[in-house]
């Protein structure tokens, strides 16, 4: 593109077609030449000739960023672009303003302008540059760190991608990509990009941000992989039906529509192109994912990116092929599927599926990886911000996580995405300016959206003749209570620590919880109705209450509490703007009440309280009682649901976030 004045004036040209498409991580040379018929210019006989002034800038969204300025043989580079941009031929060839850019990032896309000023003359040429491709982290279906170098490449190829290069990962890092998982790259090195160094993710760079590397590794070692999807000509689209699809049905539905299930790489490219769907769908590799381009709390926890629905809380395993989701299809002739047989043994079948048993969540690690790094991505998960939408697509955390979590965490969490209301959201049809406590019937207020990842269901608590047994965990973290603290925790919630007999009775009434908790006799137990790895405990595959026997009182677990009957009433309180935690306390007090304790809410639930909206409780937790299960209210079992901050079912929400409240008087 050339812009110039009439003949005999300064003219600048960039002899390249626009737009120029370049690969992420590659270098780019943009030729820019100028013809200066007035050269040299003198302002007066006594002054030296004026040298032409070259300026390169990038224009995007009405904003101009100067990359460099050159005059009289000297080049001044914008500090943000130091070591990234150069004029390779200047000043050796004074009329050659060719620009070289290293390691192109997505953020480098835009219009580049080469401008030359000489005296009062000014001419410029522009070129649109589009950086193609996206780097994504990929993990095998079974568990973390299972891919040798061959399988890593295969995983990328089967997902419409190729293994990424170090340059591509570096460019992605500079664009904001962050992942605390070691993955293979094309040069047989293993690396991972970290913006916010923290315990478990320091690697070889200590507390400095950057791409960590373990250097060249033996091809038999196993890690995850970083893939690079270049571009696609076809289209990714969603197919849905009221009852959704199993994996096989999804594949058939795409075929019926003249398409096929999209690959993970194709979905990443679609996301990069702006695709935004708050509903999870099957992909060709049997994974379940959904693309979020517009951050919102109820769709992926205010994080941008392609979110993945995992089976387990430690972000491994794909959902059961018989579970139901949308179908994500791809139509286009630009990809030709490589048959499984071209990689040897079919698909993932030759990857050992490893199971995790209590009390550790550690996975087998390659020799060079610290224990912390394997756990870093298990422990540190995203914090949904319920008020502010982030503007940059920088995933703060290693994983995307499930839109809805069923059951509680470790020993095992089984995660499913289902249609659900946002129990913490204000009803859209609510009466404005509510002052007094108002009870809404949830049937009137069902808003069909996907539940945010922080929300988790506690399986149905049985109603015992005299009261109710419930599992309790302080907001901070799992397995954090000594025996003494466990007893105090129950008392603080308005309950007492449960006895083995009470837990047994609860189990016989159908109570299941895959979390070890203290009981009155200083034993640690948990009730399992449907045994599954890793909830077998001391009973193998038989149902029953698992026990670890009497434990030293200094060991830490969760606790099972028992609440008898309610001396008073629990009521639901709300108003248009809802409450912060402290406002909820004040509001309850203004009603001659206090914020209800967890125990009081369980007792009220056992007497029939059913509310599809989560509210603050006295311990700073956010919960809601479901007596009549329905898909729109947290799943298919009755119980008191808890909204956690983290997908591993720990953490209290920010006390400044706004929700309803449950009061007790």
């Amino acid at each position: 593109v050339e812009v110039s004045e009439p003949d005999n004036s300064l003219s600048v040209s960039i002899p390249e077609p626009s737009p120029l498409r370049v690969l992420l991580g590659s270098s780019l040379t943009i030729p820019c030449y100028f013809i200066d018929p007035m050269h040299p210019v003198t302002t007066a006989p006594s002054t030296a000739p004026l040298a032409p002034r070259i300026k390169w800038s990038r224009i995007s969204k009405e904003k101009e960023v100067v990359l460099l300025v050159a005059t009289e043989g000297r080049v001044r580079v914008n500090s943000a672009y130091q070591d990234k941009v150069t004029l390779p031929n200047y000043p050796a060839i004074p009329s050659d303003a060719t620009l070289e850019i290293q390691n192109m990032r997505s953020n480098d896309s835009g219009i580049l302008r080469c401008e030359v000023m000489h005296g009062i003359e000014d001419s410029q040429a522009t070129l649109e540059v589009v950086v193609k491709g996206i780097v994504f982290h990929y993990r095998a279906i079974s568990t973390r760190y299972t891919l040798d170098f061959d399988r890593a490449q295969r995983a990328c190829l089967q997902n419409s991608a190729i293994i990424a290069t170090p340059e591509q990962l570096q460019a992605a890092y500079e664009d904001g990509f962050h992942q605390c998982d070691a993955g293979w790259l094309a040069d047989q090195t293993v690396r991972y990009p970290i913006h916010t160094p923290r315990e478990g993710c320091y690697g070889d760079k200590d507390e400095f941000p950057g791409v960590r590397t373990y250097g060249i590794r033996d091809t038999n070692e196993t890690y995850d992989v970083y893939c690079f999807a270049e571009e696609m000509e076809g289209e990714v689209f969603y197919a849905t039906s009221p009852e959704k699809f199993t994996f096989q049905e999804a594949a058939n539905e795409c075929r019926r529509l003249g398409a096929r299930l999209a690959t993970t790489g194709q979905l990443y490219l679609a996301w990069q192109g702006g695709m935004d769907m708050c509903s999870a769908g099957w992909l060709a590799d049997r994974s379940v994912r959904y693309p979020i381009s517009k951050a919102r709390p109820n769709c992926g926890g205010n994080l941008l990116g392609v979110r993945t629905v995992y089976l387990h809380a430690n972000q491994t395993g794909y959902p059961d092929p018989s579970s139901r989701y949308d179908a994500i299809c791809y139509t286009g002739e630009d990809f030709v599927d490589i048959p499984e047989s071209f990689f040897g043994v079919g698909g993932e079948e030759d990857i050992t599926i490893q199971t995790v048993t209590w009390p550790d969540v550690e996975l087998p690690l390659p020799r060079n990886i610290t224990e912390g790094e394997a756990r870093g991505s298990v422990i540190l998960t995203a914090k949904p911000d319920f008020e502010v939408s982030p503007t940059a697509p920088e995933p703060e955390e290693p994983f995307t996580f499930v839109p809805e979590v069923r059951a509680t965490a470790f020993p095992e969490v089984e995660n499913r995405t289902e249609e659900a209301t946002r129990p913490w959201a204000f009803p859209r049809e609510s009466t404005p300016g509510l002052g007094a406590p108002t009870a809404f019937t949830s049937e009137d207020l069902v808003v069909q959206v996907t539940l945010a990842p922080g929300a988790a269901e506690v399986p149905g608590q049985p109603r015992l003749p005299g009261g109710v047994v419930f599992h309790y965990r302080p907001g901070s973290s799992r397995y954090s209570l000594t025996f003494e603290e466990a007893k105090q925790a129950c008392l603080r919630t308005g309950a007492i620590i449960a006895s083995p007999e009470q837990l047994q009775a609860a189990y016989e009434a159908g109570y299941e919880q895959c979390d070890a908790g203290w009981l009155q006799d200083q034993t640690v137990r948990y009730p399992i109705v449907s045994p599954r790895t890793p909830c077998v405990g001391d009973k193998d595959s038989s149902p029953g209450v698992r026990t670890y026997g009497v434990r030293p009182p200094s060991e830490t677990y969760d606790v099972y509490c028992y609440v008898d009957r309610l001396e008073g009433e629990v009521f639901f309180a709300t108003r248009l703007e809802q409450f912060t935690f402290w406002e909820a306390q004040e509001f309850c007090e203004s009603q001659n009440a206090t914020l209800a304790t967890t125990g009081q809410l369980y007792a009220a639930w056992s007497r029939g309280l059913d509310k599809c909206y989560a509210g603050w409780l006295a311990d700073g937790s956010l919960r809601y009682p479901i007596v009549t299960p329905r898909p729109a209210c947290g799943g298919d079992k009755p119980g008191v649901r808890t909204v956690y901050l983290y997908p591993n079912q720990t953490g209290l929400l920010d006390p400044l976030s706004r929700h309803h409240a449950f009061c007790f008087r």
Epitope: L157, S160, I163, D187, E230, D334, D337
Partner: nanobody, 115 residues
Framework: EVQLVESGGGLVQPGGSLRLSCSAS????????MFWVRQAPGKDYEWVAS????????YYDDSVKGRFTISRDSAKNTLYLEMNNLKPEDTALYFC????????WGQGTQVTVSS
């Protein structure tokens, strides 16, 4: 810029042999799985053979097993396909590929098996 350039095609009689070459540049050849794909006139693409990055594993379509051999020379950044006992049904345009995306393949080299 990634480039794959195929050569070595031609007209050959049934039972004859050919050796295709693919010269690669612009990417880490030694770290990539590589493939030969073919397309007969009016037919879909057909994957012929694959080789892993080290050259230690090779896989073939049943129709060419025992007749075709894929190999690589990482020092020369070159992929090969040795084709023996050629049949008329092997007639096709042969492409060298490093990914399933058609746009990233070479231009192809024509192999015609005819008496």
């Amino acid at each position: 810029e990634v480039q794959l350039v195929e050569s070595g095609g031609g007209l050959v009689q049934p039972g004859g042999s050919l050796r295709l070459s693919c010269s690669a540049s612009g990417f880490t050849f030694s770290g990539s799985w590589m493939f030969w794909v073919r397309q007969a006139p009016g037919k879909d693409y057909e994957w012929v053979a694959s080789i892993n990055s080290s050259g230690g594993r090779t896989y073939y379509d049943d129709s060419v097993k025992g007749r075709f051999t894929i190999s690589r020379d990482s020092a020369k950044n070159t992929l090969y396909l040795e084709m023996n006992n050629l049949k008329p049904e092997d007639t096709a345009l042969y492409f060298c590929a490093r990914s399933p995306r058609v746009g990233s393949w070479g231009q192809g080299t024509q192999v015609t098996v005819s008496s």
